[in-house]
Interface confidence: low
């Protein structure tokens, strides 16, 4: 069974900051391991050093800890268009990102895919492309926004939402023609 969140934190709070309570002897506070290292052996007694070892290649710890193992380095997901911004080091996980003129779309909390920023053809840029958000486009007259691209109103079918956006244009054109014939 997974312990309740906070159990370890409650135990650690008995000791001063930067130390943790010895798992076999609750009268001993051991110094936590620095980032980039992990706990190999608990300190044998008060005032004695904790045996910390450096993380092996392909693993890391990003903060002081008393973990028995380092964490595995994340891998950038090529099939999601991700590129490596910085490699994994013993004290920092791999940093993945997107190429220039791309943005991140998050599928879930820790997973993103890179997509090209919209160029707003047949429209204007309302908000520039951000790291985690596509360009927001405003379409020119006679065009409507579909999946963040400006599409000609000639492609607007009655059943689609675009009728609200395209209808005024159609009515305007007809109105202009009518006034010219009277």
């Amino acid at each position: 069974l997974v312990p309740h969140l906070g159990d370890r934190e409650k135990r650690d709070s008995v000791c001063p900051q930067g130390k943790y309570i010895h798992p076999q002897n609750n009268s001993i506070c051991c110094t936590k391991c620095h980032k980039g290292t992990y706990l190999y052996n608990d300190c044998p007694g008060p005032g004695q050093d904790t045996d910390c070892r450096e993380c092996e290649s392909g693993s890391f710890t990003a903060s002081e800890n008393h973990l028995r193992h380092c964490l595995s380095c994340s891998k950038c997901r090529k099939e999601m268009g991700q590129v490596e911004i910085s490699s994994c080091t013993v004290d920092r996980d791999t940093v993945c990102g997107c190429r220039k003129n791309q943005y991140r779309h998050y599928w879930s909390e820790n997973l993103f895919q890179c997509f090209n920023c919209s160029l707003c053809l047949n429209g204007t840029v309302h908000l520039s492309c951000q790291e985690k958000q596509n360009t927001v486009c405003t379409c020119h007259a006679g065009f409507f926004l579909r999946e963040n691209e400006c599409v000609s109103c000639s492609n607007c079918k009655k059943s689609l939402e675009c009728t609200k956006l395209c209808l005024p244009q159609i009515e305007n054109v007809k109105g202009t023609e009518d006034s010219g014939t009277t």
Epitope: S72, H105, S108, E109, N110
Partner: nanobody
Framework: EVQLLESGGGLVQPGGSLRLSCAAS????????MGWVRQAPGKGLEWVSQ????????YYADSVKGRFTISRDNSKNTLYLQMNSLRAEDTAVYYC????????????WGQGTLVTVSS
């Protein structure tokens, strides 16, 4: 307990269609991106398709693009894969999976459903 139950597999002729379903339970379906993965006989796993938790984004492997459509019904906790223009190379066991995307591509798998494309 997380459960994923696939159905809809079977024998179909080349060019035919099938619709796979995956009934999910034991977790908050709406919160997770879901996907389909397949394993052809004697081959490794191949990632097929994925859909965002809200259903607004879909992603496909090049091998199935334009032929397969992934969808989900969050009110029914069900994931679907509509497979059209099936080819012999689509023959595989298809697995439904939850995509959390942290340490492994898929943390939870179904038992799979066999799709055989043959004349």
């Amino acid at each position: 307990e997380v459960q994923l139950l696939e159905s809809g597999g079977g024998l179909v002729q080349p060019g035919g269609s099938l619709r796979l379903s995956c009934a999910a339970s034991g977790f908050t379906f709406l919160k997770f991106s879901m996907g389909w993965v397949r394993q052809a006989p004697g081959k490794g796993l191949e990632w097929v398709s994925q859909i965002a938790n809200t259903g607004d984004r879909r992603y496909y492997a090049d091998s199935v693009k334009g032929r397969f459509t992934i969808s989900r019904d969050n009110s029914k906790n069900t994931l679907y894969l509509q497979m059209n223009s099936l080819r012999a190379e689509d023959t595989a066991v298809y697995y439904c999976a939850i995509y959390t995307g942290r340490w492994a591509p898929f943390e939870y798998w179904g038992q799979g459903t066999l799709v055989t494309v043959s004349s």
